[in-house]
Interface confidence: medium
């Protein structure tokens, strides 16, 4: 059988091979479709209610003015030419409908790294056959059940039109330290071949990197906290909590008498500045959290170790809060 695909609602003409171009003709069409119990026979004489669905044209072709889902099936024509030679035509008709452009609804504007997040729901309406939805990350296909990707799919069929609505909900677990602005898109692939996929507009949620509550981050510049005499060290206390907590500083376990600030600068380091520093973040909602402690030490000239750029002028190694 020859495969024929026709778009729902469009006309379709099936040729009856070997039939004389005009009457009188000896031919018959046999149909086995969603509209028939078994085989339905149509002749050139026609007439009756079937004419609105399918009728034989003067040249012997079968004409369907508007193909519907029920017209899927087998169409056969048997024709005899003027010399009595018999020719058979055999068609398998499949119908299709391209849906509207798929859309991502309920899209997330922010994802949290390290935990499963719903990215959004992709919806395609009005397809036949159903087809499939697939997700893409930065243009590359996402494979469900791989690397923290899961997809929940749902297919519904319209009770009157018979067309399909597809839904696909994407859940991902973004990797920590990964792309802070990934691009997701969704595409609909038709169930019948030779038709292009339809892609949604992309979405670009922001990935938020949570730091566990107990992790108040203390960063030292230069790394290691070892500097030459007269060098400068900066200590930065970073807490991702919103609103920003108050940051206080401690040296050797004793609070420093300084106003709260996220950065502590130790200019023109002298022996009195050596010690162990930490910061304490005080949240309004939960109690204080202390960072790890870092050791600030002076490298005597000639010693190995990282150095900070020295600064001009002479000072007493006073603490400066930044």
């Amino acid at each position: 059988a020859q495969n024929i695909t026709a778009r729902i609602g469009e006309p379709l003409v099936l040729k009856c091979k070997g039939a004389p171009k005009k009457p009188p003709q000896r031919l018959e069409w046999k149909l086995n479709t969603g509209r028939t119990e078994a085989w339905k026979v149509l002749s050139p004489q026609g007439g009756g209610p079937w004419d609105s669905v399918a009728r034989v044209l003067p040249n012997g072709s079968l004409f369907l003015p508007a193909v519907g889902i029920q017209d899927e099936g087998i169409f056969r024509c048997q024709a005899m030419n003027r010399n009595g030679k018999e020719t058979k035509s055999n068609y398998r008709v499949r119908v299709y409908q391209i849906p509207g452009k798929p859309e991502i609804v309920d899209s997330a504007s922010e994802l949290t790294a390290g935990v499963p997040n719903k990215v959004g729901t992709c919806v395609s309406e009005g397809s036949y056959p159903a087809g499939t939805l697939s997700w893409h990350l930065d243009g590359k296909p996402l494979v469900p059940n791989e690397k923290g990707v899961s997809v929940k799919e749902q297919t519904r069929r319209h009770p009157e039109t018979g067309l399909f609505t597809l839904q696909s909900e994407l859940m991902v677990t973004p990797a920590r330290g990964g792309d802070p602005r990934p691009t997701f898109s969704c595409s609909f692939s038709p169930g019948l071949p030779r038709h292009r996929a339809l892609r949604t507009a992309p979405i670009q949620p922001r990935v938020w990197e949570p730091v566990p509550l107990e992790e108040v981050q203390l960063v030292v510049e230069p790394e290691g906290g070892a500097v030459a005499p007269g060098g400068t060290v900066t200590l930065t206390c970073e807490v991702p909590a919103q609103p920003s907590p108050q940051i206080h500083w401690m040296k050797d376990g004793v609070p420093l008498p300084l106003p709260p600030s996220p950065v502590l600068i130790l200019p023109e380091i002298g022996p009195q500045d050596q010690g162990t520093y930490s910061c304490v973040a005080t949240h309004s909602s939960h109690g204080p959290q202390e960072s790890r402690a870092v050791s600030i030490s002076i490298i005597e000239p000639g010693e190995e170790g990282p150095t900070a750029g020295s600064v001009g002028g002479s000072g007493l190694g006073t603490l400066a809060l930044a």
Partner: antibody, heavy 115, light 107 residues
Amino acid sequence: QVQLQQSGPELVKPGASVRISCKASGYTFTSYFIHWVKQRPGQGLEWIGWIYPGNVNTKYNEKFKDKATLTADKSSSTAYMQLSNLTSEDSAVYFCVRGQLGDYWGQGITLTVSS
Amino acid sequence: DIVMTQSQKFMSTSVGDRVSVTCKASQNVGINVAWYQQKPGQSPKALIYSASYRYSGVPDRFTGSGSGTDFTLIISNVQSEDLAEYFCQQYNNYPRTFGGGTKLEIK
């Protein structure tokens, strides 16, 4: 010596995105913060935010939270700033700056947003 | 946000003079203020941090002072190469904020 080499000037259309780079050399990239600063003619300097390449933590000025995305590539010692949904208000010179002390600045990159 | 106000947009001085550039913070920022110099067509250059500490290589004619809300950058014995715009910046609170700048003109 310490250097921050920024990418060349950019001319982009409104609504587009752009990613500008800042290549660090002469020091340990992962040991110092990289700040980004915006300068519009006659409008002074605005702090956008920082990234710490050592752990890829970021801190943004709320004003730029939905405009700028800061990233860093340790392997190439390069910090990046992506600016999205560009408008004429984003036309400016953008500087990258090393460290909380702000002791070294890149040469700046001129971004022009125009149709 | 903390507002850093440099009330004088322009200052005119002569070579050899002493000039004071002022900066006022809208709230207490301790000594967490830096000063930057920006020459035409160049990126800013760090001069002073922690209100009064000079960076390496900065001539000692540049002096910073102040704490709390009032800060001053003093340039003594002004040189022609000091023709530039000077910005203050606070880093006591996020977001870091800059003053609007003071342009120094040499007569």
